[in-house]
Interface confidence: low
């Protein structure tokens, strides 16, 4: 009577030739303790004898008969709760149905468990999340419907044939609900992992290869771009032309839009892979990049620093400090925008060239009254000489000299 027996165990167990099988099992006999237990292989009920026929793998009866399989098959249960079994080693011809024939004082029951034994170690199964995005941590799962105390195994992760650096967490389950070995690997894929092969390798305790499963990574990523510029050093003179080309080295999914940015701001009406700048001015100097978007988001190229070279602009002089008191120190600074930076400066005092003064700064440690006047400068670089600016006035304050009485 089935209502008097309650069993819990995995419906089907999997193993391979030479491994072992551990069958977690619990039961409840409502009318008292177990008196007899027989484990059949592929049992069939014989109506004539009202008994089950089949290979007896294990027998535990009052008269203590022991089949020859007893060493290979172990009943690890008890008389009222536990019906756990172990078969070690397990063979290909063990595949089929295991029948647990249970008898108490008044009741009998045949419980069936499926056993699937393959010729070779079957492969694990890699489970990937539905979508993998670059730089977002995902968990790769490798699941094998096998675990047995007498046959240790390990699951190893490989990326393109090389062990993966990230530490994997392996767990096993040997419960009445499920039997499995699982390895979980937390992994932050980069775009360059797209299309690469990930392998979960089943190995025995000595690291010998048993089987594997492979998947090809589909890593969704923003477009990866390369920017090329002509001339290649991105250094031009005012009035020259510049061409920048944007190349998509990888995009998953396909790209949808293209734009160009200068110093972080989008350039209007520039939506092709080529940016042509004709007769450039110095105001067009700056950091350029292209931006290409797909469904994941925008990707940006490296920045190209465009240097538009020009002769020095009209210079100005800054004086620290004016008015100056006689005997104090004063510094003059020649300010002139130029690219490349000026290599030479010419200084003028009251319209006359100051000999030996060719630096950006002029320092006078001790001001005298005759230092007063207009100071101007001219900056020079490889492209030319700048226009001399209007200059600046130095006022020198000093006490009365040669006081005469009138």
């Amino acid at each position: 009577d089935s209502s008097k027996w309650v069993f819990e165990h995995p419906e089907t167990l999997y193993a391979w030739e030479g491994a072992c099988v551990w069958i977690p099992c619990t039961y409840r006999a409502l009318d008292g303790d177990l008196e007899s237990f027989i484990l059949f292989h592929n049992p069939e009920y014989n109506k004539n004898t009202s008994k089950f026929d089949g290979t007896r793998l294990y027998e535990s009866t009052k008269d203590g008969k022991v089949p020859s399989e007893q060493k290979r098959v172990q009943f690890l249960g008890d008389k009222n709760k536990n019906c756990t079994l172990s078969i070690h080693p397990v063979h290909l011809n063990d595949s089929g149905q295991l029948g647990l024939r249970m008898e108490s004082k008044t009741e009998k029951w045949m419980e069936r468990i499926h056993l699937n034994v393959s010729e070779r170690p079957f492969p694990p199964h890699i489970q990937l999340p539905p979508e993998i995005q670059e730089s977002q941590e995902v968990t790769l799962t490798c699941l094998l419907n096998f675990s047995c105390y007498g046959y240790p195994i390990q699951l190893q992760w490989l990326l393109e044939g090389v062990p993966m650096r990230q530490a994997a967490v392996t767990s096993t389950s040997l419960t009445i609900k499920s039997v499995f070995t699982r390895s979980e690997l937390k992994f932050s894929p980069q775009w360059s992992h797209h299309g690469k092969i990930v392998t979960c390798q089943l190995q025995d305790a000595d690291g010998k290869f048993l089987s594997n499963d492979t998947v090809q990574l589909n890593v969704k990523h923003t477009p990866k771009l390369e920017i090329k510029v002509t001339p290649s050093d991105a250094i031009v003179r005012e009035g020259d032309s510049v061409t920048m080309t944007c190349e998509v080295s990888s995009s998953n999914p396909e790209y949808t839009t293209v734009s160009w940015l200068k110093d972080g701001t989008s350039l209007k009406k520039q939506n092709t892979f080529t940016l042509n700048l004709r007769e450039v001015t110095k105001d067009q100097s700056g950091k350029y990049c292209c931006q290409v978007s797909n469904d994941v988001g925008p990707g940006r190229s490296e920045e190209v620093f465009l240097q538009v070279q020009y002769a020095p602009e009209p210079s100005t002089v800054q004086i620290l400090h004016s008015p100056a008191v006689e005997g104090s120190q004063v510094e003059f600074l020649c300010m002139s925008l130029a690219n490349p930076l000026p290599t030479n400066y010419t200084w003028y005092h009251n319209g006359k060239e100051m000999q030996g003064r060719t630096e950006e700064k002029v320092h006078i440690p001790k001001i005298l009254p005759w230092h007063a006047g207009t100071y101007s400068c001219v900056a020079e670089n490889i492209l030319g000489t700048g226009q001399r600016g209007p200059g600046a006035e130095l006022d020198v304050q000093y006490p009365p000299k040669k006081v005469t009485t009138v």
Epitope: G161, P163, M164, R165, A167, D206
Partner: antibody, heavy 118, light 116 residues
Framework: EVQLVESGGGFVKPGGSLKLSCAAS????????MNWFRQAPEKGLEWVAY????????YYADTVKGRFTISRDNAENTLFLQMTSLRSNDTAMYYC???????????WGQGTSLTVSS | QLVLTQSSSASFSLGASAKLTCTLS???????IEWYQQQPLKPPKYVME???????STGDGIPDRFSGSSSGADRYLSISNIQSEDEAIYIC?????????????FGGGTKVTVLG
């Protein structure tokens, strides 16, 4: 006891060729990826080449790509490094190294010396 | 780019504790690294690997005076009760597969001197 014994080093002229060998013992050779590393006199260590257990995956450092060939004979427990078009900057002590787990280079041979000079 | 940074030298008194640092490039702060010991005219010797969580496993024949730990992108090798035979260059290494190329990168090494 794990042992790695390199041989085949010596003097060679620039442009010449040489083959290094490494005899492994004390462990199951076919269970491990193997590497060649080198160390130039008074310089740091440099990885040269890697070969997987079954020779399916092979990697080379950019400095030797196209000139050096790594191979192994699992039946003979031997690792090889065939070197061609040798240059003076290939002068170094060459080490045969076992790789375990996550890139742990856990056993190193005593090394064999290569001098490339005219 | 995968880079390991080490200080070039360090001195410790006999019997003292030593702590060596190896810093990974910031984008690789989760990587496992390896420590190696190299004594003059000898090949490197594997000391241990150190993981991001600080757990470590030592190589064969390494005394339990050696231990590893971690903080952020820094990986440490600690030697308690340092002995004269511990005088050597300690080099950290890290491997990775980038695009289709395997690389194994070393730090510059820290030369450890034991005083007294």
């Amino acid at each position: 006891e794990v042992q790695l014994v390199e041989s085949g080093g010596g003097f060679v002229k620039p442009g010449g060729s040489l083959k290094l060998s490494c005899a492994a013992s004390g462990f199951t050779f076919s269970d491990y990826g193997m590497n060649w590393f080198r160390q130039a006199p008074e310089k740091g260590l440099e990885w040269v080449a890697y070969i997987s257990r079954g020779s399916h995956t092979i990697y080379y450092a950019d400095t030797v790509k196209g000139r050096f060939t790594i191979s192994r004979d699992n039946a003979e427990n031997t690792l090889f490094l065939q070197m061609t078009s040798l240059r003076s900057n290939d002068t170094a002590m060459y080490y045969c190294v076992r790789m375990a787990g996550y890139y742990a280079m856990d056993y190193w041979g005593q090394g064999t010396s290569l001098t490339v000079s005219s | 780019q995968l880079v390991l940074t080490q200080s070039s030298s360090a001195s410790f008194s006999l019997g003292a504790s030593a702590k060596l640092t190896c810093t990974l490039s910031s984008q690789h702060s989760s990587y496992i690294i390896e420590w190696y010991q190299q004594q003059p005219l000898k090949p490197p010797k594997y000391v241990m690997e150190v993981k991001k969580d600080g757990s470590h496993s030592t190589g064969d024949g390494i005394p339990d005076r050696f231990s590893g730990s971690s903080s952020g992108a820094d990986r440490y090798l600690s030697i308690s009760n340092i002995q004269s035979e511990d005088e050597a260059i300690y080099i950290c290494g890290v491997g990775d597969t980038i695009k289709e190329q395997f690389v194994y990168v070393f730090g510059g090494g820290t030369k450890v001197t034991v005083l007294g």
